[in-house]
Interface confidence: medium
Amino acid sequence: AGLKLMGAPVKLTVSQGQPVKLNCSVEGMEEPDIQWVKDGAVVQNLDQLYIPVSEQHWIGFLSLKSVERSDAGRYWCQVEDGGETEISQPVWLTVEGVPFFTVEPKDLAVPPNAPFQLSCEAVGPPEPVTIVWWRGTTKIGGPAPSPSVLNVTGVTQSTMFSCEAHNLKGLASSRTATVHLQALPAAPFNITVTKLSSSNASVAWMPGADGRALLQSCTVQVTQAPGGWEVLAVVVPVPPFTCLLRDLVPATNYSLRVRCANALGPSPYADWVPFQTKGLAPASAPQNLHAIRTDSGLILEWEEVIPEAPLEGPLGPYKLSWVQDNGTQDELTVEGTRANLTGWDPQKDLIVRVCVSNAVGCGPWSQPLVVSSHDRAGQQGPPHSRTSW
């Protein structure tokens, strides 16, 4: 079989948007199954027609309604003949149109009066492609060959730039790039103390506007009174916008404020935020826990706990915990140093403990008091010790 791309030059140049019909002539076969191939891949196009010129001469058509850049490439036709694939001479389809941008100017954020560059590149065909730069509505500089780099010495306000690409088919305009001025960041906001203990505080905040420059760090300043002596200053890399303040004094009033910085410098500080560390839990356990049996139940008594340090704050109430070996257990809170215990089983051993609490929590538990089911009273001692008389 003889194959040729009919009347087709080796190169076929078509304007973008125009229709194209490629013709393939097959001689020496009665019923050729003509396939079209583009750049090595079979073309799945249902607009393929066949004309029988004679019994042994066929013409196949590949019809493209409106060519675009992606249709450009190397085309050939092929037929199966006796188990072998015969291919025609290729035709190079070139699609010409207005320039096509491969690189367009990008938005930038720059410090005032700092130099910067913008890039623009466009291709044909047809070549050559020339680039003209625009600053706002003003043309800057004469045509330059593509690709083109625009060097700008600096701007003092937000400015628009675009490029225009020209070739024999016409011109194309790029996107408009906005060059913003960088500025100092805005103050942070929503500053919250998220967790508090007697010596630590966790702080979180929302960053203000970054001034179009990446925020690099934030500073948390801590004082014991707004505007007082600085107790602590912590510089943290961001994100995340959080900080842990350590080694604070318990039960103390503090204030903190935060500012964040970008490459140009720091933001103003946010307003002071007051907070108070928690006090310490009581350090001592109640002493001399003992029990007195009565007809109505069991009276428990212990010695009052005196605060060891002012940081413990006011003490009280006391918390009493008791358990029996039948699994019964309970807790009760009492204001004084004496408690009347009811609801327990006198036939079972009883273990009692007491602690004193404050706003922070309960102090250490006292030595456990074991009240034996045989005792008329009980005394402190190791758990499971029994005293009877």
Epitope: D33, D47, L49, Y50, I59, K65, S66
Partner: antibody, heavy 125, light 108 residues
Framework: EVQLVQSGADVKKPGASLTISCQAS????????ISWVRQKPGKGLEWMGQ????????MYGPSFQGHVTISADRSTATAYLQWRSLEASDTAMYYC??????????????????WGPGTLVTVSS | SYELTQPPSVSVSPGQTARITCSGD??????AYWYQQKSGQAPVLVIY???KRASGIPERFSGSSSGTMATLTISGAQVEDEADYYC???????????FGGGTKLTVL
């Protein structure tokens, strides 16, 4: 004169298999493609797929891929549309169409000019 | 999957111009074809390759295509033109054909 003669109407139960046919005459069968088009009662036309001139290559619409098989016998100039397992939703009129391929007198393409009269398939339990 | 969108119905008086539109993303690249189907009959090709009239079709039928929209125009519609009209084209890669949903033309 170009003629496409389709097999007669058929009533089947869901799950049954079925093959309908389209016999071409009045032209060289291998000069053209054959397409199948479905039309459900009171609804529009749906392109199901086609088989090329040499019965060697088929193309299917996305909704029909895997559900039907298009084939052809060049020796009898007949195209076929086959179901392995019919569903009630297959109830429709099925047309075979002589598709683009060769051209009339080598000039004007006869795109989808010739349609068969249609085969009515009813699937009902 | 690819879709071609047509208005469900168009009404005109006899002698008026009827326009039926068909929109699809691939129409800038792929040709549109138009079919007429009268009640109980097989469809008949009216327009192929956007604007070419099929043999035996009256001159009052014309087609055009611009961007993603193809249009069938019937200049001076007749009562006998009352039918369903379908546009037909390929999806962008050319792997399969698609019919539009159809437009019922009423000539009152």
């Amino acid at each position: 004169e170009v003629q496409l003669v389709q097999s007669g109407a058929d009533v089947k139960k869901p799950g049954a298999s079925l093959t309908i046919s389209c016999q071409a005459s009045g032209y060289t069968f291998t000069d053209y493609w054959i397409s199948w088009v479905r039309q459900k009662p009171g609804k529009g036309l749906e392109w199901m797929g086609q088989i090329n001139r040499h019965a060697s290559n088929t193309m299917y619409g996305p909704s029909f891929q895997g559900h039907v098989t298009i084939s052809a016998d060049r020796s009898t100039a007949t195209a076929y549309l086959q179901w392995r397992s019919l569903e009630a939703s297959d109830t429709a009129m099925y047309y075979c169409v002589r598709s683009g391929g060769a051209t009339s007198g080598g000039t004007i393409p006869e795109y989808y000019q010739h349609w068969g009269p249609g085969t009515l398939v009813t699937v009902s339990s | 999957s690819y879709e071609l969108t047509q208005p469900p119905s168009v009404s005109v008086s006899p002698g008026q111009t009827a326009r039926i539109t068909c929109s699809g993303d691939a129409l800038p690249k792929k040709y549109a074809y138009w079919y007429q189907q009268k009640s109980g009959q097989a469809p008949v090709l009216v327009i192929y390759e956007d604007w070419k009239r099929a043999s035996g079709i009256p001159e009052r039928f014309s087609g055009s295509s611009s961007g993603t929209m193809a249009t069938l125009t019937i200049s001076g519609a007749q009562v006998e033109d009352e039918a369903d009209y379908y546009c037909y084209s390929q999806e962008r890669k050319g792997n399969y054909f698609v019919f539009g949903g159809g437009t019922k033309l009423t000539v009152l």
